[in-house]
Interface confidence: low
């Protein structure tokens, strides 16, 4: 092989020399020389580096700010960042989860198709014929209309997407 003009994986070129990169969780203190290997130091408390690197400073762990509705889902290590998620009833506004908003509620006439998670909002769907929702809720699905027939009753008032049917007694023929 000819002298290096590029270095192999997990090395970097400096002053026509190939030096080892620092492993994840460590930062660069000094480049290698003809006689010494690259000098690296572990990241401090609340710091991390997640790649083989030549960084002279570690990154700070993300802060999960409770004022923004955030809490720690997974504590950071020297090699990984902290992962935040949202408090119950809230969800992240972005993939990075930098802030939270309240889960959306489904209005009357709409039911919950998919309950919200820490990272995705509630998905609502209109109640189809035969179903209704009379509340604003982040959890309630559309409910089926009551079946008057099974109760030996008759429909006195038709149901809508927001209201149930009203059942009543059957009219009896008098003698």
């Amino acid at each position: 092989p000819e002298p290096p003009t590029a270095c192999r994986e997990k090395q970097y070129l400096i002053n026509s020399q190939c030096c080892s990169l620092c492993q994840p969780g460590q930062k660069l203190v000094s480049d290698c020389t003809e006689f010494t290997e690259t000098e690296c130091l572990p990241c401090g408390e609340s710091e991390f580096l997640d790649t083989w690197n030549r960084e002279t400073h570690c990154h700070q762990h993300k802060y999960c700010d409770p004022n923004l509705g955030l809490r720690v889902q997974q504590k950071g290590t020297s090699e990984t960042d902290t992962i935040c998620t949202c408090e119950e009833g809230w969800h992240c506004t972005s993939e990075a989860c930098e802030s939270c908003v309240l889960h959306r509620s489904c209005s009357p006439g709409f039911g919950v198709k998919q309950i919200a998670t820490g990272v995705s909002d509630t998905i609502c769907e209109p109640c189809p014929v035969g179903f209704f929702s009379n509340v604003s809720s982040a959890f309630e699905k559309c409910h089926p209309w009551t079946s008057c027939e099974t109760k030996d009753l008759v429909v006195q008032q038709a149901g809508t997407n927001k209201t149930d049917v009203v059942c009543g007694p059957q009219d009896r023929l008098r003698a």
Epitope: E2, P3, P4, S16, C18
Partner: antibody, heavy 119, light 112 residues
Framework: QVQLVQSGAEVKKPGASVKVSCKAS????????MNWVRQAPGQGLEWMGN????????NYNQKFKGRVTMTTDTSTSTAYMELRSLRSDDTAVYYC????????????WGQGTTVTVSS | DIVLTQSPDSLAVSLGERATINCRAS???????????LHWYQQKPGQPPKLLIY???NRFFGVPDRFSGSGSGTDFTLTISSLQAEDVAVYYC?????????FGQGTKLEIK
């Protein structure tokens, strides 16, 4: 400190094979190419080839191609050189030597392994 | 293959005197990155070679400053400014710019 410790002396018959080992310590084994150099009695130094332990890539001196195989075991930080179809003129001291990537010279050497080929 | 020819084959120098060993290459050892890939080694009887000088002029770790390398292109010199008794050895030049890497035939240095 960097150390390369080689296996002991070998006596072989013509046509046989020999496998010499070189155990490295004191540095990151996969970060440096390992070279093999031989020296016949009273003669000069002859470069046989080298191996990159990280990828397993080899460079052989054409003179030995087809007869020599260089391998490594990264789990034990050991390099191996096997020479086949031995002849009497393969009698020599065989050295492993680390290539200093920053120097591009052979910066640390094993103590040598004497291989004698005799019928 | 690049041929390295050392001169003289043997050399006797008085203690404290200067010793000069030459090495001539059959083609240039200067890389496009401006480095010259010519190195010098010292070998004492029964021992492996030791790196003295790398890339033309650079002394390896622990090598006394009485050893120096010089030259350019195809002609190179190893100089020992003031010979000491422990410098008695065989000296080899080596190139690592083209495979196969090659060594000079060696120069035996003795005390006069």
């Amino acid at each position: 400190q960097v150390q390369l410790v080689q296996s002991g002396a070998e006596v072989k018959k013509p046509g046989a094979s020999v496998k010499v080992s070189c155990k490295a310590s004191g540095y990151t084994f996969t970060g440096y190419n390992m070279n093999w150099v031989r020296q016949a009695p009273g003669q000069g130094l002859e470069w046989m080839g080298n191996i990159d332990p990280y990828y397993g890539n080899t460079n052989y001196n054409q003179k030995f191609k087809g007869r020599v195989t260089m391998t490594t075991d990264t789990s034990t930080s050991t390099a191996y050189m096997e020479l086949r179809s031995l002849r009497s003129d393969d009698t020599a001291v065989y050295y492993c030597a680390r290539l200093g990537l920053q120097l591009y010279a052979l910066d640390y050497w094993g103590q040598g392994t004497t291989v004698t080929v005799s019928s | 293959d690049i041929v390295l020819t050392q001169s003289p084959d043997s050399l006797a120098v008085s203690l404290g005197e200067r010793a000069t060993i030459n090495c001539r290459a059959s083609q240039s050892l200067v890389h496009s990155n401006a480095n010259t890939y010519l190195h010098w080694y010292q070998q004492k009887p029964g021992q492996p070679p030791k790196l003295l000088i790398y890339k033309l002029t650079n002394r390896f770790f622990g090598v006394p400053d009485r050893f120096s390398g010089s030259g350019s292109g195809t002609d190179f010199t190893l100089t020992i400014s003031s010979l000491q008794a422990e410098d008695v050895a065989v000296y080899y030049c080596q190139q690592s710019i083209h495979v196969p890497w090659t060594f000079g035939q060696g120069t035996k240095l003795e005390i006069k």
